[in-house]
Amino acid sequence: LQDPCSNCPAGTFCDNNRNQICSPCPPNSFSSAGGQRTCDICRQCKGVFRTRKECSSTSNAECDCTPGFHCLGAGCSMCEQDCKQGQELTKEGCKDCSFGTFNDEEHGVCRPWTDCSLDGKSVLVNGTKERDVVCGPSPADLSPGASSVTPPAPAREPGHSPQ
């Protein structure tokens, strides 16, 4: 026997108080799929959250963060304060990256500079709080009489023609 509620489209709910007829979701609620027995309350984007997409009878509101904050978590469940490049967010607020670390974004954490020596290379450009070091050729490559090697042309992805 077919469930009478299965006929209720998105934007409505199967109303047990009215012989399981389909009743429209009231304002500030939604049902995104058919056959629902209740409508869900719309998400409210308040405080540091702001509305990216309004709630309707068939879809929940979507939030993002006010300027100076960025989204974290599924569906922007949290807003975290932005810091400047060269900083990271700590319990005490935004703090400069310590020496030997950098952050080139307005969120995230300070990461250690690349250790060029691990690849047998030398530091071409020193790192800063905002930028990683740039590694250059190994010291041996820079010695007099070292043969210059032309690097091979980068391989093309299949199906891509030259621009």
Epitope: G11, T12, P24, C25, P27, C42, C55, S56, S57, T58
Partner: antibody, heavy 117, light 112 residues
Amino acid sequence: QSVEESGGRLVTPGTPLTLTCTVSGFSLSTYAMIWVRQAPGKGLEWIGVVYDNGYISHATWVKGRFTISKTSTTVGLEITSPTTEDTATYFCARSADGSWSTYFNLWGQGTLVTVSS
Amino acid sequence: DIVMTQTPASVEAAVGGTVTIKCQASESISNYLAWYQQKPGQPPKLLIYKASTLASGVSSRFKGSGSGTEFTLTISDLESADAATYYCQTNYCCSSSDNGFAFGGGTEVVVK
């Protein structure tokens, strides 16, 4: 896309009257429709709204004086027992989108209802 | 329902001047406010929505601002065609006192 009101006429007090808002070029299952009235020389007054999913809400002051209905291509407004205070131009307007907190960007020209004995 | 109070009821200004119209909501409506222009014998025309966003085809001389309970419509470089009555309307669906689309009382703008 258009909305057009019809049904306005001279009626005697107490005689029910139904106004019709006919839409073309869009679907009432996608947009909310609002009824607004304007007495001669007065301001705009919100009467009620029917949302895309069929939910109907009236302004608090309405208290049974008006009934809103909806078909696939029309929205109705019944003035259940008109009084002389209901003399006004009645406008129907379409929402900009299907959200609950919407605004109204497509209006009809209005239909005039005169209630007089 | 939310009550919208609009001031002044009427304002007169010269061509090229600036007019400011205020609208106050009886409770916070975030930025859910629209402004309409209405000329005699015509339906209202949407000017601004979400308190400050200009509707399509509307001159940038119209500027909306505010949030919460206090809102302002400013018309700068006034033109004779701006002579009309202006209305604010809340479009905050889900207030504590039921949903509503209440209008302010209107402001008549007279251009000299």
